[in-house]
Interface confidence: low
């Protein structure tokens, strides 16, 4: 392919040319390329207009290209470029106009590029820049140059892993000129030892991240004091597990935060055993969101009412015991992936709406009611990936719940009462892999608003799916995979008229039945993969609901034997619904194992008597049918011949064609023959058939009996149309009954031989007879019309006044 | 397959091979070398990743004397405010890091331990590297 050795990811759009030892920019990629990855190639030098071949580029990755010099206008033609990545290039020389022409650049990544100063970085004209990442460089001064006042769209500035030690008042002066800037600033992993008090006074930042910046507790305290006056939406402090950490840490560390205005606070990774971590947060009582990530909290008093937090997040922390939570204003609590404190203890959170307690290995003695959480406002509850949860209450006081997730926890007492009876507002329920054994038909009673139900990986009494969904009239998604199901009630899904997706995969069904799905008139996706389906339950399978768009029957145990031939044929008939048909393979018999079901032609062997009787029967029936068929048309055509025998032919030719070729018939055939000299009169069904008369009768009486000849317009559409083939077959009979009749074949377009062979007679006739081929060129058209007129004039008595036919006693006419 | 030796300790010998086509160079040092009876030390890694390390996780396939243990997924980088500083490393950026480790009180029986480490990162997820570690364990006492 033209783009090789690069990889085409999205045709004409995305190309991956990573690590191909290119020394220059490739020139064999399309002009339309938008995403280009040239990383890990030894390009070394970028001259002017290096990328003129790619005017549409939006993303350009030049990571680790050993680039040392970038000349003026290297990217000059890239006015659409939004992302430029230069990570890991040892840049020695950067021309002042290196980034000129990048009028749409939003993201510039210059990580590990030997950058020693922002002052000399020529990006002042990049007004559209939103993200500047200059981490892992040699920058010593935090002075933001004057040109930053042009970067009015800047949202992210990453200066982490540099050499910044001090921050002075003058360093941030430019930010005072940009009060509307919504800047997130990352200064992590800089060896800070001094922040001048007042440096951040009256400065607004969206986010400030300071992790692993201080080599002692005193330095940390002093620097935090230096942040006084800062207004920050989100402040992230902490350390990294794999970097040098402070020797000690105590409750005075964060005292300086009282002088900041903070909306959201996060402490990320802190591995110290503190007497009582709560004392650390005296200056953070009024933040709206408070997060602890990977913090050791061995001993903790209660998180109590005097905190005004609305969102509390405790993630990946180590606890001695489950904390006591009494927070009046808290609306969201995320307590996930924590260790220790395995038993859930009641909390008192009267305003709580969102509660995520997932992945803690917690056990609940009795779940769930308002008293567990001290709230009646809860809308979202996630208890997934926990330990044993014993259901002892049906969510009394928690009627507002809309989202409930228990997946991969071990639910007990689920089939003893209607657990969800009061949850009439619940929209989403996940009880997948919860060791639930459904033995009670009222398990889902009360869930009248439920739209999504996931219950994969559970089990049912006797592996039978009963009528447990009767109240779930609004359900749109149902997952019953991996439930060891073998049978289902024929009416199990009758009330689910809104259901769109049904997953029945990974069960133990041996047969398929369409009956249970008859009421699912919104069903779009049905997944029956990974079962043991061999055959159908009933002899006659009906159709699935007409809304169905995807049917997955992959990885089943299809029995490709004569016994199941009707089922296999039914599967073939569903071809347009089936997904991944190549993974639908025969399981038995052994000689057909692994063969694709849809490409299989089963020739069925039966005993000789049955074959003999069958063949004889078929022959007799066939002969009778053929005789009746021939006799019927013989009589009809004969009757017509007697009726019209003494009269004149009204038409010179009856035209048989597919309605999809009507444009050609109207614009070419009719125009040239009826308006030409001599004029021919054609019989056309859209114009000359009598309304209200049966089509077959019209074809015979109006078409054949009143026409001298028949013109057959052969095309792909013609061969695929049953009506056309029907008309053509009558034409054959007509030719057979009236030896002088002439059929003129016009081949309108090259017809695929395989398609033509399906109509054996037509194939033979076209092989034996000369036919006219339509060719849309000046010379071709001329020859075509001359030959067609000649064929139609044959047997025609012409006078300029009108068209006179020769009646039923036609003269001999050659077929062309 | 070329075998890369890591280190020898009093009760173990550790080496690895690549189990992917890419075989991008990675330098692994353990100091002191791991002793399976109890160990504390530093793991030093030098590596230039071919994709961002954001959302890095390992799939671990452990075999003990030809017996396969269930696949284990170890999430290293969640995607924001991660524990390790290398989680913010970008494609092509040098990762040069030291990680401390310690474990104690685990009794391992004599034999050959294999651990396939599949590192997966990024969005969309793709394989970063794949290494197969072989630990030959010869305990002094069982």
């Amino acid at each position: 392919e033209s783009w090789e050795p690069c990889v085409e990811v999205v045709p004409n759009i995305t190309y991956q040319c990573m690590e191909l030892n290119f020394y220059k920019i490739p020139d064999n990629l399309p002009f339309s390329t938008k995403n280009l990855d040239l990383s890990f190639n030894p390009l070394r030098h970028l001259g002017s207009y290096s990328f003129f071949s790619f005017p549409e580029l939006q993303v350009l990755d030049l990571s680790r290209c050993e680039i040392q010099t970038i000349e003026d206008g290297a990217y000059q033609s890239l006015s659409h470029l939004s992302t430029l990545i230069l990570t890991g290039n040892p840049i020695q020389s950067l021309a002042l106009g290196a980034f000129s022409g990048l009028s749409s650049l939003q993201k510039l990544v210059a990580v590990e590029t030997n950058l020693a100063s922002l002052e000399n970085f020529p990006i002042g004209h990049l007004k559209t820049l939103k993200e500047l990442n200059v981490a892992h460089n040699l920058i010593q001064s935090f002075k933001l140059p004057e040109y930053f006042s042009n970067l009015t769209n800047l949202e992210h500035l990453d200066l982490s892993s540099n050499k910044i030690q001090s921050i002075y008042c003058t360093d941030l002066r430019v930010l005072h000129q940009m009060p509307l800037l919504n800047l997130s600033l990352d200064l992590s992993l800089n060896p800070m030892n001094f922040i001048q008090p007042g440096a951040f006074k009256e400065i607004r930042l969206h986010k400030l991240t300071l992790r692993n910046n201080f080599d002692s507790l005193n330095v940390m305290k002093t620097c935090i004091q230096g942040l006084a006056g800062l207004e920050v939406h989100r402040l992230v402090l902490g350390e990294f597990r794999n970097e040098g950490n402070l020797e000690k840490f105590d409750k005075s560390a964060l005292e300086g935060l009282c002088n900041l205005t903070i909306e959201e606070f996060r402490l990320a990774y802190l591995d110290y055993y503190l007497d009582d971590i709560i004392d650390l947060f005296n200056c953070l009582t009024n933040v709206s969101s408070f997060s602890l990530v990977s913090v050791t909290i061995e001993r903790v008093k209660d998180f109590s009412y005097n905190f005004g937090w609305q969102h509390l997040e405790l993630v990946n922390c180590k606890f001695g015991q489950f904390p006591t939570l009494k927070l009046k204003s808290l609306k969201r609590l995320t307590f996930t992936s924590n260790k220790g404190g395995n038993a859930f203890s009641e909390v008192d959170l009267p305003s709580l709406e969102f509660l995520d307690l997932s992945r803690n290995g917690l056990s609940f003695k009795g779940c769930c009611s308002q008293s567990d959480f001290g709230t009646t406002s809860l809308k979202y509850l996630d208890l997934s990936f926990n330990g044993v949860i014993t259901m002892s209450s049906n969510f009394l006081g928690l009627e507002q719940l809309e989202h409930l997730d228990f997946q991969h926890s071990n639910l007990k007492q689920m089939s003893e009462f209607s657990v969800f009876l009061s949850l009439r507002n619940l929209i989403y329920l996940d009880i997948s892999h919860t060791h639930t054994r459904v033995a009670f038909n009222g398990i889902f009673n009360g869930l009248s608003s439920l739209e999504v139900l996931k219950m994969a990986g559970n089990s049912f009494q006797e592996n039978f799916l009963p009528d447990i969904f009767t109240e779930l009239r609004n359900l749109t998604f149902l997952d019953l995979s991996q439930c060891q199901l073998e049978q289902l009630s024929p009416t199990a899904f009758n009330s689910l008229s809104s259901l769109q997706v049904l997953n029945m995969s990974h069960n133990n069904f041996f047969s398929l039945d369409t009956f249970p799905y008859k009421c699912l008139n919104s069903l779009q996706v049905l997944d029956y993969s990974l079962n043991h389906i061999m055959t159908s339950k009933k002899q006659e399978l009906q159709h699935f609901p007409s809304s169905l768009a995807f049917l997955n029957l992959t990885q089943n145990d299809f029995a490709c034997t004569c016994e199941h031939q009707s089922f296999l044929q039914w599967i073939k008939d569903q071809r347009q619904l089936l997904v991944e048909v190549e993974r639908m393979e025969c399981a038995t018999p052994s000689d057909k194992q692994g063969m694709p079901v849809l490409s299989l032609n089963i020739t069925c062997q039966m005993n000789k008597t049955i074959i003999g009787v069958s063949v004889l029967s078929v022959l007799v029936v066939s002969v009778v049918a053929v005789l009746v068929y021939k006799f019927y048309f013989h009589l009809m055509l004969l009757a017509g011949c007697i009726k019209y025998g003494r009269g004149e032919n009204i038409y010179d030719a009856f035209v048989i064609y597919s309605s999809q070729d009507e444009d050609w018939v109207r614009n070419e055939l009719v125009k040239n023959l009826e308006e030409g000299v001599p004029p021919f009169q054609l019989c056309l069904h859209y114009r000359d058939f009598i309304p209200g008369v049966a089509i077959a009768a019209n074809i015979i009486h109006e078409g054949f009996h009143k026409s001298r000849k028949v013109i057959v317009v052969v095309s792909q559409h013609f061969i695929q149309s049953r009506w056309c083939i029907f008309e053509y077959e009558i034409a054959q009979t007509w030719q057979f009954l009236s030896s002088r009749a002439g059929i003129i074949f016009i081949v309108l377009q090259k017809v695929e031989k395989t398609l033509l062979r399906q109509q054996v007679e037509l194939y033979r006739l076209l092989s034996r007879n000369t036919y006219l081929e339509w060719e849309d060129s000046v010379l071709g058209r001329h020859i075509f019309w001359r030959r067609l007129r000649k064929a139609l004039l044959d047997g025609k008595s012409w006078n300029p006044e009108g068209t006179v036919g020769t009646g039923c006693n036609w003269q001999e006419a050659t077929s062309i | 397959q070329k075998q890369y030796w890591v280190c020898n300790s009093s009760d173990a010998s550790i080496s690895y091979t690549y189990c992917d086509k890419m075989q991008y160079p990675i330098s692994i040092n353990v100091n002191p070398c791991i002793e399976l009876k109890r160990s504390k030390g530093l793991l030093h890694i030098f590596y230039i990743p071919r994709r961002d390390l954001k959302q890095l996780y390992f799939n671990l396939y452990i075999t003990v004397n030809t017996m396969n243990l269930p696949k284990r997924k170890e999430v290293i980088c969640r995607g924001s405010d991660d524990d390790y500083s290398f989680c913010r490393a970008l494609k092509g950026e040098t990762v040069n890091t030291t990680i401390s480790f310690s474990f104690k009180g685990i009794k391992f029986s004599k034999g050959k331990y294999k651990c396939v480490v599949e590192a997966i990162s990024g969005s969309p997820e793709e394989m970063l590297f794949c290494l197969e570690f072989v630990i030959l364990h010869q305990p002094n006492s069982n």
Epitope: I427, Y428, S449, E451, V452, N474, T476, F477, S498, Q500, V501, S522, Q524, V525, S547, A549, F550, V579 | S123, P124
Partner: antibody, heavy 120, light 106 residues
Framework: QVQLQQSGADLVRPGALVKLSCTAS????????IHWVKKRPEWGLEWIGW????????IYDPRFQGKASITADTSSNTAFLQLTSLTSEDTAVYYC?????????????WGQGTTVTVSS | QIVLTQSPSIMSASLGEEITLTCSAS?????MHWYQQKSGTSPKLLIY???NLASGVPSRFSGSGSGTFYSLTISSVEAEDAADYYC?????????FGGGTKLEIK
Amino acid sequence: QVQLQQSGADLVRPGALVKLSCTASGFNIKDSYIHWVKKRPEWGLEWIGWTDPENVNSIYDPRFQGKASITADTSSNTAFLQLTSLTSEDTAVYYCARGYNGVYYAMDYWGQGTTVTVSS
Amino acid sequence: QIVLTQSPSIMSASLGEEITLTCSASSSVIYMHWYQQKSGTSPKLLIYRTYNLASGVPSRFSGSGSGTFYSLTISSVEAEDAADYYCHQWSSFPYTFGGGTKLEIK
């Protein structure tokens, strides 16, 4: 942050076809549905269909069946809309939008729109 | 398919006024989403699932309704609320939008 970046405007001839792209950033398209919506001047919004990139499913409004084809490439986090046999009726702004969290949430983020003009 | 009819098709309101836009469905739907589209911009999610406010949407917007009748209320109209408003159902296939209500500020 979550963004959907659509391809630029297209001027196409009647009878031709056009393929629009929608590149997502800030989230993985495998975790959501990507919808396509049509907006003609002086008309309201018309839903064309959605794709579920994780399961490689696409569903269409019957009015657009045969006219539209929605696909996704999860490796580049991009969804595509291909329109065939274009007529003046297809002149419109086409938006892609994220349908969040499975089958029941609304379209919470939209692309900036791609203007398709069908003209000879 | 379910047809959503929005009324009025054009509405004029004064600053500070409370207004209600309605959307009726040809047959019952489970819930309704509402979108706002200002001139020359993409639509923006306003209300999801009948009454939930999308993030960043001012609290002056509220939604209600059930069955075949749904409404969007703006408690105190501001100049920036001038836009087209569309209701949208995603509970019955194919998913449909209303014809829209154009809100003009006097």
